[in-house]
Interface confidence: low
């Protein structure tokens, strides 16, 4: 199984960014870390969606990764989709260093994450408490600033 | 709310070496990772090096093989040792911290010039 991968994150507009996982054991919580920069000040959904595949752009990836058919949730919420990480928060200079321990997300298995995209939205991810429908769908983070495909990495 | 104080910046010729350090104003041991990042004039910051508290490193292309982030939590202390520094290393450095969850904390920065 892969214990390490990579995310290149790259959009139509200035944002960019690199995330690394690392799974130490197969089982084991996912550390997931980087750094992105060109964000507006404040929080940012951040997700893995469904498809690996960005060859319209980001809107190709599809919805938030969700084998188990749940509503959209916070990452330490029970009712959530395999792919909510939640927030990354911007600084002033729009720089969010990222620093996530996920459990649900794996490399390896059902809820592997490999071959899928990560993406990074507009707007703040309600974590399905917003009170619409659209809440537990996406948890209004609105449009996709950028994207990558999350690859094995050495 | 921690308060980073970065040090050992300064003056070095292409080829030279430099120790930066970043002490902490409270412990370390139970933030989740630490970063050097820079910014050298008119351009934007970018991320140099960061440490988990697992021990996971992560580096910069442009840096890779040259520099080496260490953390020693019992001097609440962040280290990044410079090697084989070049013209275009000269930039301000600036440590971070980021505990889980956000938002993170922020050094001054410490000036770095690499400088025949």
């Known amino acids: 199984m892969a214990t390490k991968a990579v995310c290149v994150l790259k959009g139509d507009g200035p944002v960019q960014g690199i995330i690394n996982f690392e799974q130490k054991e197969s089982n084991g919580p996912v550390k997931v870390w980087g750094s992105i920069k060109g964000l507006t000040e404040g929080l940012h959904g951040f997700h893995v969606h469904e498809f690996g595949d960005n060859t319209a752009g980001c809107t190709s990836a599809g919805p938030h990764f969700n084998p188990l058919s749940r509503k959209h949730g916070g990452p330490k919420d029970e009712e959530r989709h395999v792919g909510d990480l939640g927030n990354v928060t911007a600084d002033k200079d729009g720089v969010a260093d990222v620093s996530i321990e996920d459990s649900v997300i794996s490399l390896s298995g059902d809820h592997c994450i490999i071959g899928r995209t990560l993406v990074v939205h507009e707007k703040a991810d309600d974590l399905g408490k917003g009170g619409n429908e659209e809440s537990t769908k996406t948890g209004n983070a609105g449009s996709r600033l950028a994207c990558g495909v999350i690859g094995i990495a050495q | 709310q921690v308060q980073l104080v970065e040090s050992g910046g300064g003056i070095v010729q292409p080829g030279g070496s430099l120790r930066l350090s970043c002490v902490a104003s409270?412990?370390?041991?139970?933030?989740?990772?630490m970063y050097w990042h820079r910014q050298a004039p008119g351009k934007e910051r970018e991320l140099v090096a960061g440490?988990?508290?697992?021990?996971?490193?992560y580096y910069a292309d442009s840096v890779k093989g040259r520099f080496t982030i260490s953390r020693d939590n019992a001097k609440s202390t962040l280290y990044l040792q410079m090697n084989s520094l070049k013209f275009e290393d000269t930039a301000m450095y600036y440590c971070?911290?980021?505990?889980?969850?956000?938002?993170?904390?922020w050094g001054q920065g410490t000036q770095v010039t690499v400088s025949s």
């Open positions: 971070a911290a980021l505990p889980n969850p956000p938002p993170g904390y």
């Open positions: 440490i988990t508290n697992d021990g996971t490193r």
């Open positions: 409270e412990s370390i041991s139970e933030i989740d990772a």
